[in-house]
């Protein structure tokens, strides 16, 4: 992937739109949308000041860990859906899109240098463990996906892209 492709706001917006669509199709869906287990996902809440004051390398650690955990969670959701007796087609489609989207975002972040950034800061080893919550429905899973993109990921790329411009 081109190193700074994710710095084009339209790129992130595309994935964000997909995540919101996925969240919307699960609104009011009970029957097909239970995960039947609790899946660990990143906590997407952001204390805006605290986040902005973080070193960009520390932000990278949190985004990288969050993205890895979220990818794992969506893959688990996909496996549960495949194993269900009658997977609901629209849900299957959006789960597959989310898996693909998270893979692409991982590639784009790697190209931006997020992985390198996440390994290099001296305080990376002493970083606070990633805060997590659980999702028991696809709606919650997609909401976490959407919030992660709107929050930590967008804030991090904004900062990393600006730093790269200097």
């Amino acid at each position: 992937a081109p190193p700074r492709l994710i710095c084009d706001s339209r790129v992130l917006e595309r994935y964000l739109l997909e995540a919101k669509e996925a969240e919307n199709i699960t609104t009011g869906c009970a029957e097909h949308c239970s995960l039947n287990e609790n899946i660990t996902v990143p906590d997407t809440k952001v204390n805006f000041y605290a986040w902005k004051r973080m070193e960009v390398g520390q932000q990278a650690v949190e985004v990288w860990q969050g993205l890895a955990l979220l990818s794992e969670a969506v893959l688990r959701g996909q496996a549960l859906l495949v194993n269900s007796s009658q997977p609901w087609e629209p849900l299957q489609l959006h789960v597959d899109k989310a898996v693909s989207g998270l893979r692409s975002l991982t590639t784009l972040l790697r190209a931006l240098g997020a992985q390198k950034e996440a390994i290099s800061p001296p305080d990376a080893a002493s970083a606070a463990p990633l805060r997590t919550i659980t999702a028991d429905t696809f709606r919650k899973l997609f909401r976490v996906y959407s919030n992660f993109l709107r929050g930590k990921l967008k804030l991090y790329t904004g900062e990393a892209c600006r730093t790269g411009d200097r």
């Epitope: 809440k45 952001v46 204390n47 805006f48 000041y49 902005k52 909401r143 919030n147 709107r150 804030l155």
Partner: antibody, heavy 117, light 107 residues
Framework: EVQLVQSGAEVKKPGESLKISCKGS????????IGWVRQMPGKGLEWMGW????????RYSPSFQGQVTISADKSISTAYLQWSSLKASDTAMYYC??????????WGQGTLVTVSS | SYVLTQPPSVSVAPGKTARITCSGD??????AYWYQQKPGQAPVLVIY???KRPSGIPERFSGSNSGNTATLTISRVEAGDEADYYC??????????FGGGTKLTVL
């Protein structure tokens, strides 16, 4: 002790300009942001915007964008809120507050601005 | 723009528990903050990051936040707790939004 001291009350006429100040002491001024909050008579709190004096980054509430200007002079640990043309509806108490991980954790005493013809 | 809604008033007898609510679309996805303002005074932060208390705030003050609602709970209410209470939150974009405020009356 963290202190934010605001400039005194102002009485102005519609159309006049005004700049009020907020001086921080007892802490590193550039290590925190300063936020501005409006409280109209008998009403609630309204966030106007914040400034990061270190990076000179400013964010305005959509309701106040274009209506006021927020600035800071880090050399004298002071933040400012200014109007180029006051309206009667700008009559209110204006508070500055320090923004930290505990947002708006220390407040100024407030500056009462009265705009009347 | 994001909107936070609070009840205009809440009444409670001394020694009882007061609960003040704040609702907003998916508010549980954001941190909630609570301020106390007494007449003629500047506001004071009483709860941050949903449930944390700044130093100097009594343990009687607690907070929770999930779904669309954040709640400030004041246990063993005292006459000195009578004040206006405001909730607030950060948006992902960096805006800080205040609720309309709730007047707490101690009967």
């Amino acid at each position: 002790e963290v202190q934010l001291v605001q400039s005194g009350a102002e009485v102005k006429k519609p159309g006049e300009s005004l700049k009020i100040s907020c001086k921080g002491s007892g802490y590193s001024f550039t290590s925190y942001w300063i936020g501005w909050v409006r409280q109209m008579p008998g009403k609630g709190l309204e966030w106007m915007g914040w400034i990061d004096p270190y990076r000179s980054e400013i964010r305005y509430s959509p309701s106040f964008q274009g209506q006021v200007t927020i600035s800071a002079d880090k050399s004298i640990s002071t933040a400012y809120l200014q109007w180029s043309s006051l309206k009667a509806s700008d009559t209110a108490m204006y508070y500055c507050a320090r923004v930290s991980s505990e947002p708006f954790d220390s407040w100024g005493q407030g500056t009462l601005v009265t705009v009347s013809s | 723009s994001y909107v936070l809604t609070q009840p205009p008033s809440v009444s409670v007898a001394p020694g009882k528990t007061a609960r003040i609510t704040c609702s907003g679309d998916k508010l549980g996805d954001h941190y909630a903050y609570w301020y106390q303002q007494k007449p003629g005074q500047a506001p004071v932060l009483v709860i941050y990051d949903d449930s944390k208390r700044p130093s100097g705030i009594p343990e009687r003050f607690s907070g929770s936040n999930s779904g669309n609602t954040a709640t400030l709970t004041i246990s063993r209410v005292e006459a000195g707790d009578e004040a206006d209470y405001y909730c607030a939150t950060w948006t992902f974009e960096g805006d800080y939004v205040f609720g309309g405020g709730t007047k707490l009356t101690v009967l």
